[in-house]
């Protein structure tokens, strides 16, 4: 590597993937093993992350870029750039400090991660239930009875906006 | 450096007993919740048990309930796993692991873990 000629600062040319090392009269020296520097200048290199246990590797450590983790199955990532893994559960299920529990009667969840949520309450909407829910299913709902009575008019006005999955508290 | 560091797997005969260690170092263990999780050959990561700060709540997995215990001891940094009536499905990489900050609030992640050590539970 180069020996270092910035009138201003020795350490600004050393590229990254190098560090400025004061104990060699600031030569840019390459990071070491299981270390990086993701910019240039750096007079340190920073320690790689370690993917084990409930992390496994997405993408390696380089010299210039840091590993990055992803969860081992059975796990889903939280946080930026995968900062924990928290457990799956099944449909129907939340996860709880007591693990994965079954939805209660009127609330499911059709994912593998987050809570369960209420029903739709059709009837706010002047619907009726079509199909009942499940823990693993919200209920889907139809026309409204009155639609369903003959001669009764063909068109119903629309449903107010709400977020799906949820009934108002 | 935050780590954990298991011991204490080993060859089990059916029915028998064995305990877990972890140690804990770079972080002050009594600050957070702990959880062991496992992974048998070919299946994904399952969670065992957990314990609170202090100790007085511990949850477990239905399937190991009334025959693992969670423990651990602040003053020595160490969070431990108590097996006995093992069997044959018991046989897995069992890692400690920690719930990260807001663990049982928000979220119940894990962010830090070990390297793990193996159980088997063979005659």
């Known amino acids: 590597f180069e020996r270092t000629r910035s009138l201003q600062d020795p350490c600004s040319n050393c590229p990254a993937g190098t560090f400025c090392d004061n104990n060699r009269n600031q030569i840019c020296s390459p990071c070491p093993p299981n270390s990086f520097s993701s910019a240039g200048g750096q007079r340190t290199c920073d320690i790689c992350r370690q993917c084990k246990g409930v992390f496994r590797t997405r993408k390696e450590c380089s010299s210039t870029s840091n590993a990055e983790c992803d969860c081992t199955p059975g796990f889903h990532c939280l946080g930026a750039g995968c900062s924990m893994c928290e457990q799956d559960c099944k449909q129907g299920q939340e996860l709880t400090k007591k693990g994965c529990k079954d939805c209660c009667f009127g609330t499911f969840n059709d994912q593998k991660r987050g809570i369960c949520r209420p029903w739709t309450n059709c009837s706010l909407d002047g619907k009726s239930v079509l199909v009942n829910g499940t823990k693993e299913r919200d209920v889907v709902c139809g026309p409204s009875p009155a639609d369903l009575s003959p001669g009764a008019s063909s068109v119903t006005p629309p449903a107010p906006a709400r977020e799906p999955g949820h009934s108002p508290q | 450096e935050v780590q954990l560091v298991e011991s204490g797997g080993g060859l089990v005969q059916p029915g028998g007993s064995l305990r877990l260690s972890c140690a804990a170092s770079?972080?002050?263990?009594?600050n957070y919740w702990m959880n062991w999780v496992r992974q048998a050959p070919g299946k994904g990561l399952e969670w065992v048990a957990n314990i609170n700060q202090d100790g007085s709540e511990r949850y477990y997995v239905d399937s190991v309930k009334g025959r693992f215990t969670i423990s651990r001891d602040n003053a020595k940094n160490s969070l431990y796993l108590q097996m006995s009536s093992l069997r044959a499905e018991d046989t897995a990489v069992y890692y400690c692991?920690?719930?990260?900050?807001?663990?049982?609030?928000?979220?119940?992640?894990?962010?830090?873990s070990g390297q793990g050590t193996t159980v088997t539970v063979s005659s």
């Open positions: 770079g972080f002050t263990l009594s």
């Open positions: 692991a920690r719930g990260g900050e807001g663990y049982g609030v928000d979220h119940y992640g894990l962010d830090v």
